[in-house]
């Protein structure tokens, strides 16, 4: 009886109904179910479609723009549980822009274990006020149910029996009102005694066994559950998986060979993104948690001694990184078994993304090739790379190869970075902004000095467009206020003073003094530094009275440390030799100033002579806060308080409405009208600042959700149509 059909992987069904038939034998969807973007479907297309075997979805159910679908009562008549193991933007059930949906109709839905419900912008959707969500999920206050037909009070929701003057459905209390609960005009909401909690009950209200979740065919029997509260094992619901079983996907017990098969299936497949499952804490999980590494003999995760190695074996012995996406496939790798070819021509926020994905690599067994990576300014994103073994070499016996990288200015900060190249030579050609001094420094540090032959490092095509003879610029004057820093530095003039076009001042917030020039920079416009162009000062013929160039930095944050450096901007000379100067990075902190106001003050009186005041620290302390000043003043009592007849019938008790914290404008208008005088003499009050702010927050929240939805559901068409059914993770 428990889960009579198959366990199916997560599904994304879009464009047409063809793939919907894959649900036919599914009892459990291990993952999410998304049905979306069907613009040509009509009501009759759904008439004979039903998936009565589907009992549980482990992640979330999302319905978005499916035309013609008017109810889910026939489609998923037995869907009982949505576990919400993984959520869609905090939601386990999302019904969004379903233009023809008239009712939900999920009349067997008894439990949403985690997450809440978002039902929004469904112009025809009724039977929402008749559902008591508190019987289905815990976090009702996080539900977001707005902009549906139900909001406009146009729904004539009639529960079964009402038309004949009977009340067939259970009534529950919301806002002190007893309301009949139903999903459709022919289906009541099943309500169990509250003592049954989420275990469910029989038709007579007898509680299911406490290992059940949502429903059962008989009470007190863990083999008669419709779904399990904890884990499923051999037709029975159990609290925990006994040896020799392992917990899998938070809902079922599997044996070692099941987990091992998943591991090997992924290992032997060429599919990206599958998981080589491992065993940890009696669970079969996609990968070892941080601090653990897999013991290949038994798949067990064992604690690492020091940082965990993660050896990544490259198919065909090498991998080309040509985008952030391909870099993500190496996320977490510490040892690359093979060779890397970096060929990045563009992208967004590249330096940070590359560091996030490649920054843990410590060792490459083969060679490293940087080729036509116009977007790279530095290789510092390989933050931990310490060893290139050169066990396989690029043609010509090269273990490090840099060719035609138009914007590469720095390899690593050699004062902070050690790199050993065990065997093989260096190759540098056509790197116009990379100074030869930087390359020679690499020879020394990496131990490759003397290995290179004459043409391995081109003297004419490396650094030919860079300021390579850098002198050191020194700051001569620094003055701070709370929002400004005034800087001056020693003058610099190249041999031909007309070559000096000016100075570039670089600065950024730097809480720690560990910044390097090329952090966060790429050639595609991403730059964590703010850059100011400064004209050269007037040149004096008297060297003793030279003007010191400088700049007043304005609009800074108080009590904030900034990293600052300055460098010259000089013209490119005909002799292929460019001069220039640059300062070291200095750190300067702005002064403190008045803090912003303390946040969220709350006052409560706990006795006739005491008031307790609480608040949160200001969002901008602008310094070290040492104390707060509290002012108070006695105010006259409002005489109205004494004169008011508190027994007046017009007074209403404050009550929480059933809808979520953020209400639609329509419902706000409706709420206001409730408090208007029946004679119609009073007009509604103007919105308070907090109401306006709340509306702005709601609008922003709505936009954020929509952006997230669109980013997730709109994906480029794939050329192949593989379903990925062999991967037990959601597709």
């Amino acid at each position: 009886h428990l889960y009579p059909g198959e366990v199916c992987p997560g599904m994304d069904i879009r464009n047409n109904l063809t793939r919907l038939h894959e649900l036919e034998n599914c009892s459990v969807i291990e993952g999410h179910l998304q049905i979306l973007l069907m613009f040509k479907t009509r009501p009759e297309d759904f008439r004979d479609l039903s998936f009565p075997k589907l009992i549980m979805i482990t992640d979330y159910l999302l319905l978005f723009r499916v035309y013609g679908l008017e109810s889910l009562k026939d489609l998923f008549p037995n869907l009982t549980v949505i576990r919400g193991s993984r959520l869609f933007f905090n939601y386990a059930l999302v019904i969004f822009e379903m233009v023809h949906l008239k009712e939900l109709g999920l009349y067997n839905l008894m439990n949403i274990t985690r997450g809440s419900v978002r039902i929004e912008k469904n112009n025809e959707l009724c039977y929402l006020a008749t559902i008591d969500w508190s019987r289905i999920l815990d976090s009702v206050e996080d539900n977001y149910i707005v902009l549906n037909k139900d909001d406009n009070e146009e729904c004539g929701d009639i529960c079964p029996g009402t038309a004949k003057g009977k009340t067939n459905c259970p009534a529950t209390v919301i806002n002190g009102q007893f309301v009949e609960r139903c999903w459709t005009h022919s289906h009541c909401q099943k309500v169990c005694p509250t003592i049954c909690k989420s275990h469910g009950c029989t038709a007579e209200g007898l509680c299911c066994h406490s290992e059940c979740l949502g429903n059962c065919s008989q009470p007190d029997d863990p083999t008669k559950c419709v779904a399990c509260r904890n884990f499923y094992l051999d037709g029975r619901c159990v609290e925990t998986c006994p040896p020799p079983y392992y917990h899998f996907q938070d809902w079922r017990c599997v044996n070692f060979s099941f987990c091992q098969d998943l591991h090997h299936k992924c290992k032997n497949s060429r599919r990206q993104g599958c998981h080589q499952y491992v065993i940890h804490n009696n669970k079969c999980i996609p990968e070892c948690p941080s601090g653990y590494t897999m013991n290949s003999s038994n798949l067990l995760c064992t604690p690492c001694l020091g940082p965990c190695p993660k050896v990544c074996h490259l198919l065909e012995g090498e991998k080309t990184i040509d985008s952030v996406t391909s870099a993500q496939e190496l996320r977490g790798c510490t040892v690359i078994n093979g060779s890397l070819i970096i060929n990045i021509r563009g992208g967004n926020n590249l330096a940070a993304e590359l560091e996030a994905n490649l920054g843990l690599i410590e060792e490459i067994s083969g060679y490293l090739k940087i080729r036509r990576s116009y977007a790279l300014v530095s290789l510092s994103f390989f933050r931990k790379l310490r060893l290139i073994r050169g066990e396989t070499l690029e043609i010509g016996n090269y273990s490090f190869y840099a060719l035609d990288n138009q914007n590469l200015r720095q390899l690593w900060d050699w004062s902070k970075h050690n790199l050993t190249i065990t065997q093989g030579k260096l190759f540098f050609h056509y790197n116009p902004k990379l100074c030869l001094s930087e390359i020679h420094k690499m020879e020394e540090v990496s131990g490759t000095k003397g290995r290179q032959e004459r043409n391995d490092i081109a003297l004419k095509t490396n650094g030919d467009q860079a300021s390579c003879e850098n002198e050191l610029l020194k700051f001569s004057y620094i003055r701070t206020s709370f929002d400004k820093i005034l800087l001056r530095w020693e003058p610099y003039w190249p041999p031909d003073f007309r070559d000096l076009l000016g100075f570039m001042l670089f600065y950024k917030e730097a809480p720690y003094q560990n910044v390097t020039e090329f952090d966060g920079q790429d050639a595609c416009g991403s730059n964590s530094w703010t850059v100011v162009d400064i004209d050269p000062p007037l040149r004096s013929n008297d060297p003793k009275s030279q003007n010191h160039p400088g700049w007043l930095m304005r609009g800074l944050k108080p009590w904030t440390q900034y990293a600052i450096f300055v460098k010259t901007l000089v013209t490119f000379s005909d002799e292929r030799r460019t001069y220039g100067a640059k300062s070291d990075i200095i750190y300067v902190q702005t002064d403190a100033t008045n803090p912003s106001v303390p946040l969220d003050p709350i006052s409560v009186s706990n006795s006739s002579s005491q008031i307790i005041l609480k608040w949160k620290p200001p969002s901008d302390p602008n310094g070290n806060i040492t104390h707060y000043l509290v002012f108070w003043e006695r105010q006259a009592e409002d005489s109205e308080l004494f004169e008011l007849d508190y027994c007046l019938k017009g007074l209403k008790l404050p009550s929480r409405t059933w809808s979520p914290p953020f209400e639609s404008e329509d419902s706000q208008k409706h709420n206001q009208s409730e408090y208007e005088d029946s004679a119609g003499e009073c007009c509604s009050c103007p919105k308070t600042d907090s109401q306006i702010l709340k509306e702005l927050e709601e609008s922003s929240f709505r936009k954020t959700f929509e952006d997230y939805l669109h980013n997730v559901v709109f994906v480029p068409r794939k050329t192949s149509s593989g379903t990925g059914a062999e991967d037990p993770r959601p597709s």
Partner: antibody
Framework: EVQLVESGGGVVQPGGSLRLSCAAS????????MTWVRQAPGKGLEWVAN????????HYVDSVKGRFTISRDNAKNSLYLQMNSLRGEDTAVYYC???????????WGQGTLVTVSS | DIQMTQSPSSLSASVGDRVTITCRAS??????LAWYQQKPGKAPKLLIY???SLQSGVPSRFSGSGSGTDFTLTISSLQPEDFATYYC?????????FGQGTRLEIK
């Protein structure tokens, strides 16, 4: 045949303690909620406490919270009620009952009398 | 807590009579109500659960009805062995509570 047999009742002074036991047979004990109900002499029934199948969920009437503890041992098919800080108003016949679907008490023991008196 | 009030507290009837006992809950309890019969010196016996479902082995002359706050136990034709005290019990929420009882005596 389903059988529930209570034991452990007796006379105890106010402030004293007693431990009641209920031995179950004739059904799969570990599949059912179990309950204690009491009846003061000449009075009606009062639900005291219940416990779910694996002992992870327990509920008590307010008047005994913090003083009484319900527990079970599924391996021994036994239900227990540890009663501490006993008061005069705790004097009653204590019944152990099986909760069908948690709340329909379909089988009861014969009861054991607890008398709290100085 | 949900209070359960039975009426009448006691009643006299003759064999063959049709008898109705009512039970009122202080708040709605849907159909989550049970009826018990107790004879002197004996443990209670379950008659009806879920307001109207007859417990197996209980004679069909016993029936229950009602939902929300008002419930009734009906004995269609009183038999000599039916003279006892009857209790209703709500199971909507903890603490589970019983009515004060209705004593059914021979007239």
């Amino acid at each position: 045949e389903v059988q529930l047999v209570e034991s452990g009742g007796g006379v105890v002074q106010p402030g004293g303690s007693l431990r009641l036991s209920c031995a179950a047979s004739g059904f799969t004990f570990s599949s059912y909620w179990m309950t204690w109900v009491r009846q003061a002499p000449g009075k009606g029934l009062e639900w005291v406490a219940n416990i779910n199948q694996d002992g992870s969920e327990k509920h008590y009437v307010d008047s005994v919270k913090g003083r009484f503890t319900i527990s079970r041992d599924n391996a021994k098919n036994s239900l227990y009620l540890q009663m501490n800080s006993l008061r005069g108003e705790d004097t009653a016949v204590y019944y152990c009952a099986r909760g069908r679907g948690a709340w329909a008490f379909d089988y009861w023991g014969q009861g054991t009398l607890v008398t709290v008196s100085s | 807590d949900i209070q359960m009030t039975q009426s009448p507290s006691s009643l006299s009837a003759s064999v063959g009579d049709r008898v109705t006992i009512t039970c009122r809950a202080s708040q709605g309890i849907s159909s989550w109500l049970a009826w018990y019969q107790q004879k002197p010196g004996k443990a209670p016996k379950l008659l009806i659960y879920a307001a109207s479902s007859l417990q197996s082995g209980v004679p069909s002359r016993f029936s229950g009805s009602g939902s929300g706050t008002d419930f009734t136990l009906t004995i269609s034709s009183l038999q000599p062995e039916d003279f006892a005290t009857y209790y209703c019990q709500q199971a909507n929420s903890f603490p589970i509570t019983f009515g004060q009882g209705t004593r059914l005596e021979i007239k």
